[in-house]
């Protein structure tokens, strides 16, 4: 069965999928589909990378983590309902069948229709990708939501102080983790 | 224009061993996973190994086996030479086939979208 | 392992005529890994529908593919000679990737 993430409309999705280098630098191909995993490498692929870098790659879809230590999470971009469904993240370990291969399921939901200030939507339009913060499981996705009482100092402070979060290195608990070697 | 070439093909007595090459052209081979499939004759086909691009070495790719080949047969391949190889050993009659080498499309699309002409695999005493 | 069994066996049809070939599995497959591959004598097998109901480049728009689940078919609108030629079903959804045993379409 595959675990289930969440996004609004509008908003950047998460699925995490980490892995852990043999050696700094020794990395292993990875592949990242819309659909089930099948047999071999992914169905649809939406982001690849070999031993060295992304090699492949289609608009919205994007590795925000360092893929070199292994952070090969996804990130799709303003997401829409059509991105629901489930995503496969293909760790190819060589050998004899020995890639590991993740099932996560995105939902997508319809975007809350608040009222908000125009300062607001300024900064959403300025800092689109520091509105979804990563949730500490695997369901969870939170985000800031309505801020008609933040004045301008205080969405940069809060700007900063997500951008500058590790809340990617708690999702290893609870995302697709391999280990290798 | 994408091609596939088999090769390697024979008669062989049970328990002996051959080894078949695919010469591929035509598109980037290390950026492809590639299969082995065989066809006994007048029989349907069957699916037999896969190896994965291992675009930067042959080393670092993934490679499947069929149940019933699986520690006689060896999938390999040379991207510097552009050859798919598939080492056969302990051949049993049951192994009479034509063998085709096949690509895997890496976008994930057209699975085995481009086939070789097959090269026939006699075991027989 | 999943079985694929393709009905019937062979089959002949008159130019013209509707075809349809059956495929069914064992346990459920993913349509999106449901194919289909047409093989004349002599010659290797040539990718024909991919993802249960789109046609390869070249084929005939004459074709289609449908299904779910465990039940997926290939249908011909409308018969003619050169659509003379086994049919294999695959799937390559779960461990192992398997065929269907074909389907032998005749021209009467």
């Known amino acids: 069965s595959e675990v289930e993430y969440r996004a609004e409309v509008g908003q950047n999705a998460y699925l995490p999928c980490f892995y852990t280098p043999a050696a700094p630098g020794n990395l292993v191909p990875v592949c990242w589909g819309k659909g089930a995993c099948p047999v071999f490498e992914c169905g649809n692929v939406v982001l690849r990378t070999d031993e060295r870098d992304v090699n492949y790659w289609t608009s919205r879809y994007w590795l925000n983590g360092d893929f070199r230590k292994g952070d090969v999470s996804l990130t799709i971009e303003n997401v829409t309902l059509a991105d629901s469904g489930i995503y496969c993240c293909r760790i190819q370990i060589p050998g004899i069948m020995n890639d590991e291969k993740f099932n996560l399921k995105l939902v997508i939901k319809p975007a809350k229709v608040t009222p908000a200030p125009t300062r607001q939507r300024d900064f959403t339009a300025a800092f689109p990708r520091m509105l979804t913060t990563r949730g500490h499981g695997p369901a969870e996705t939170q985000t800031l939501g309505s801020l008609p009482d933040i004045n301008l100092t205080q969405i940069s402070t809060l700007a900063n102080e997500l951008r500058d979060s590790r809340l990617a290195n708690d999702l290893r608990d609870s995302g697709a983790t391999i280990r290798i070697g | 224009e994408v091609h596939l070439v088999e090769s390697g093909g024979g008669l062989v007595k049970p328990g002996g061993s051959l080894k078949l090459s695919c010469a591929a052209s035509g598109f980037t081979f290390s950026d492809y996973g590639m299969h082995w499939v065989r066809q006994a004759p007048e029989k349907g086909l069957d699916w037999i190994a896969y190896i994965s691009s291992g675009s930067i070495s042959s080393d670092s790719s993934t490679i499947y086996y069929a149940d019933t080949v699986k520690g006689r047969f060896t999938i390999s391949r040379d991207n510097a030479k552009n050859t798919l190889f598939l080492q056969m050993t302990s051949l049993r009659s049951e192994d009479t086939a034509m063998y085709y080498c096949?690509?895997?499309?890496?976008?994930?699309?057209?699975?085995?979208?481009?086939w070789g002409q097959g090269t026939s695999v006699t075991v027989s005493s | 392992q999943i079985v694929l069994t393709q009905s019937p066996a062979i089959m002949s049809a008159s130019p013209g005529k509707k075809v349809t070939l059956t495929c069914s599995a064992s346990s459920s497959v993913s349509s999106s890994y449901l194919y289909w591959y047409q093989q004349k004598p002599g010659s290797s097998p040539k990718l024909w529908i991919y993802s249960t109901s789109n046609l390869a480049s070249g084929v005939p728009a004459r074709f289609s593919g449908s299904g779910s689940g465990t039940s997926y078919s290939l249908t011909i609108s409308s018969m003619e000679a050169e659509d003379a030629a086994s049919y294999f079903c695959?799937?390559?959804?779960?461990?192992?990737?398997?065929f269907g045993g074909g389907t032998k379409l005749e021209i009467k």
């Open positions: 096949a690509r895997h499309d890496w976008r994930g699309l057209y699975g085995m979208d481009y």
């Open positions: 695959h799937q390559w959804s779960s461990y192992p990737p398997t």
